[in-house]
């Protein structure tokens, strides 16, 4: 059987001779040279050589455990004479023994980290990690200990974990923002002779809201003319805040003072300035100086710093209103008046009023801007502002009149104001209804009595509140003995019906029917329209065969029933079929 122990070999051998590993030996070996030892496997014949007579193994090269810690080889013992193995082939291991030849290496050359300013002592900042390639299972070659080389007294590092923590109270970003910390990792548990590596940790203090806004001055003064319209900026104020970002955001507000309702303050988000603006129209004659208390405050407050005091500051803003010579002011921005369309000339519609707002209270005179009333339909009393008609009106021509009235200071004609007047003309029933179109129809000679031959529609230029209600009738002079009747459908339409059986076009080729149309409003309006009815010869289908030529001259064509219009090329047969009219032979 084989006789050996596990082989151990120290790494990084620096001697001039080959490094002795150990001896392979079989108990069958009598020392007479009859056995031959053969080595195979990892590095055999190259890294490792064997004396085939004695079984001594040597390493020919310097070995690095960190590159390969274990080599597995196989040993054979062969009878030289027979060439047969005297031992079964056996596997053996050469273990490379570690020495401390690797320093700890950090996972990053440079670490960056942030921590809030004013953080409590012991606040975690970042964890650094160094690794050592030496054997952690043997000795202390790979046992790393961390220490701080630079960065005290601000930061500390846990020796075992590499966790960096704050070490100083009240670190203030506003004093110092950036810190460079150097951390060392040393093996051999930090003992003398251990190898070491370092890394740099760049630590930035992040801002917290630990500084209130502060006005650089306690009083500001601005001037603005009384003519400044609402929204006009009149001055800027700025509180400073040592913080940054949202912690330095400032909201401005008016907290007190007599101009609370006259002025606004808005925050310029870009500059963090407070812009004082006009909120309501100013009037020098009413008030000349306003004193406001303006407050600047941080909207984002950290409760733990409230002990430092209120995170706001106040300043006084004095606003002086400058006098401006102002034009007259009307009592309304616009006037809406109404008048009936049947109003007589010189009817008063209403009045306007304007006043000089200045202390002088200059008298004003009124006039109509003739560019807005070219036809001179309206006039105004220059002294009292009464508007009256100077021409007759007609709602059906123009429903709304939009005119402009001018008020001018008598002592200073350059100062004038304008105001729009919207005058609505109210409807009066002053138009008679009339036919919606020219009606010309026909009747066949063989028509039956009570047959509908045309539906009439009416229109009316007036505009009653809920639509028209028309009545239709044959004019009295045509009613007695007429060959046709009018049937009022009570729906603003009427039908013309035949009154007898049969018509003779040779006796009477054309009938002119005077139809009276009335509205049912007040004052009553009515008119008379004429419907032309031609007598035509038709076949038994109702197709027109012959009429007087005039019956064909209207391009809208002939029509019957329900007021339908037909193209002049429509077949009359189609028309009558559509109306379901019955015919006699």
């Amino acid at each position: 059987s084989w006789m050996w122990n596990q082989f151990f070999l120290l790494e990084e051998y620096t001697g001039s001779d080959y490094q002795y590993v150990g001896k392979l030996h079989s108990d069958q070996d009598r020392g007479d040279g009859s056995l031959k030892y053969i080595l195979s496997g990892d590095g055999a014949g190259d890294l490792f050589i064997i004396n085939e007579n004695t079984g001594d193994i040597q390493a020919t090269k310097r070995l690095d455990r960190e590159e390969k810690p274990v080599y597995i080889l196989r040993a054979q013992a062969i009878n030289r004479r027979t060439g047969r193995p005297v031992e079964p082939e056996s596997e053996f291991i050469i273990k490379i023994h570690d020495i401390n030849d690797n320093e700890p290496i950090f996972t990053k050359d440079v670490y960056t980290a942030t921590v809030p300013e004013m953080a409590d002592v012991g606040t975690f900042v970042v964890q650094v990690t160094a690794t050592d390639a030496d054997d952690p299972t043997y000795g202390n070659s790979a046992k790393v200990v961390y220490s701080i080389l630079q960065g005290q007294p601000y930061f500390s590092v846990e020796s075992e974990t590499g966790i960096i923590k704050t070490a100083l109270l009240n670190m203030d970003r506003e004093n110092r923002e950036q810190y460079q910390v150097v951390i060392q990792a040393k093996d051999m548990g930090g003992q003398m002779g251990g190898l070491s590596g370092t890394t740099t940790v760049n630590i930035t203090l992040t801002d917290v809201n630990d500084n209130p806004p502060r006005f650089p001055q306690s009083t500001y003064q601005f001037k603005t003319p009384e003519s400044s319209p609402p929204g006009t900026p009149i001055g800027r104020i700025k509180a400073s805040d040592a913080d940054v970002g949202e912690n330095a955001e400032i909201e401005y507000s008016i907290t007190d003072g007599e101009g609370h309702d006259m002025f606004d303050v808005i925050t310029d988000q870009e500059t963090q300035e407070g812009i004082i603006t006009v909120k309501k129209l100013l009037d020098f004659e009413k008030k000349r100086v306003y004193t406001l208390k303006v407050e600047a405050s941080n909207p984002h407050i950290e409760p733990r710093f409230l002990y430092l005091g209120p995170f706001k500051d106040s300043a006084t803003v004095r606003i002086v209103v400058d006098d401006v010579d102002e034009p007259p002011v009307f009592s309304k921005l616009a006037y809406i008046l109404q008048i009936r369309e049947d109003a007589q000339i010189n009817t008063t519609i209403g009045s306007v009023a304007a006043q000089d707002p200045d202390a002088a209270r200059n008298p004003v005179k009124y006039s109509v801007d003739r560019h807005t009333d070219m036809d001179r339909i309206f006039n105004i009393d220059s002294g009292n502002g009464s508007i009256f008609t100077s021409k007759l009106l007609d709602r059906e021509t123009l429903l709304w009149h939009n005119i402009t009235v001018i008020a001018t200071e008598i002592n200073n004609p350059k100062q004038s104001s304008r105001v729009p007047l919207y005058i609505k003309v109210l409807d009066v029933n002053d138009n008679a209804p009339e036919f919606a179109e020219f009606y010309e129809t026909f009747v066949c000679e063989k028509a039956k009595a009570d047959q509908l031959i045309q539906t009439l529609h009416a229109v009316d230029k007036d505009d009653p509140y809920s639509g028209h209600q028309f009545s239709f009738s044959l004019a009295p002079e045509a009613a007695s003995g007429s060959n046709f009747t009018i049937q009022d459908n009570k729906d603003n339409t009427a039908g013309i019906l035949t009154r007898k059986n049969g018509y003779n076009r040779h006796e009477m080729s054309t009938y002119l029917l005077p139809v009276v149309i009335s509205d049912n409003d007040y004052p009553v309006q009515s008119s008379t329209g004429t419907v032309t009815v031609r007598v035509c010869a038709c076949d038994h289908h109702g197709n027109m065969q012959s009429c007087h030529a005039e019956a064909l001259i209207h391009p809208t064509g002939l029509s019957t029933g329900a007021g339908s219009e037909f193209r002049h090329d429509s077949g009359l047969n189609d028309i009558f079929e559509a109306q379901k009219i019955e015919w006699h032979e």
Epitope: L426, P464, Y465, Q469, S471, S473, A479, N520, Y522, V524
Partner: antibody
Framework: QVQLLESGGGLVQPGGSLRLSCAAS????????MNWVRQAPGKGLEWVSV????????NYADSVKGRFTISRDNSKNTLYLQMNSLRAEDTAVYYC???????????WGQGTLVTVSS | DIVLTQPPSVSGAPGQRVTISCSGS????????VSWYQQLPGTAPKLLIY???NRPSGVPDRFSGSKSGTSASLAITGLQAEDEADYYC???????????FGGGTKLTVLG
Amino acid sequence: QVQLLESGGGLVQPGGSLRLSCAASGFTFSSFAMNWVRQAPGKGLEWVSVISSSGSNTNYADSVKGRFTISRDNSKNTLYLQMNSLRAEDTAVYYCARPSYFQAMDYWGQGTLVTVSS
Amino acid sequence: DIVLTQPPSVSGAPGQRVTISCSGSSSNIGSNFVSWYQQLPGTAPKLLIYDNSNRPSGVPDRFSGSKSGTSASLAITGLQAEDEADYYCSSYDSFDHSWVFGGGTKLTVLG
């Protein structure tokens, strides 16, 4: 169906006032002019007043001019007659009526009696 | 004021024909349509004839109207007992934009 219903009549002293109402239904009230017609006991019909569909035009019989005022509220479908400075000769049944068909009054209310007496 | 003139009363036996006349002027009957009303005792007037000669639905064809110039007339044929009532003519007056009535005619059905 069309209905007109008067109310507000009663006994009043000479010089007094009364307001009559006429509630309309069954038709588009705001499209029609409306009339008041009265009938003294044992006498004939007498036209009193008219108002246009929008209420913008009115007219009165000479016998009531300056004392009576006709008005309407189209949103409530109601016609009114305000009677002031009443006299004994104003005693009558007052009807509201709708003029249509060339001013023929096709619908009448049942009437309300106004008695002016001391 | 009674502007249109009617006879105060007419009478006729059942089955007979009676006419009631109504006289006006050019501003009313002469230029506008005439309507007729029937008033039964204790009731509101009822439209009988409009547009001079047209009957509303429900009015028997025994009633007919006509107009000529400034006069109008109402004819009732086949007189019946229920026709006993007061009859009024009326017209719009274009002169003063008012309505005018006749004084009324009392129809008595004899027997």
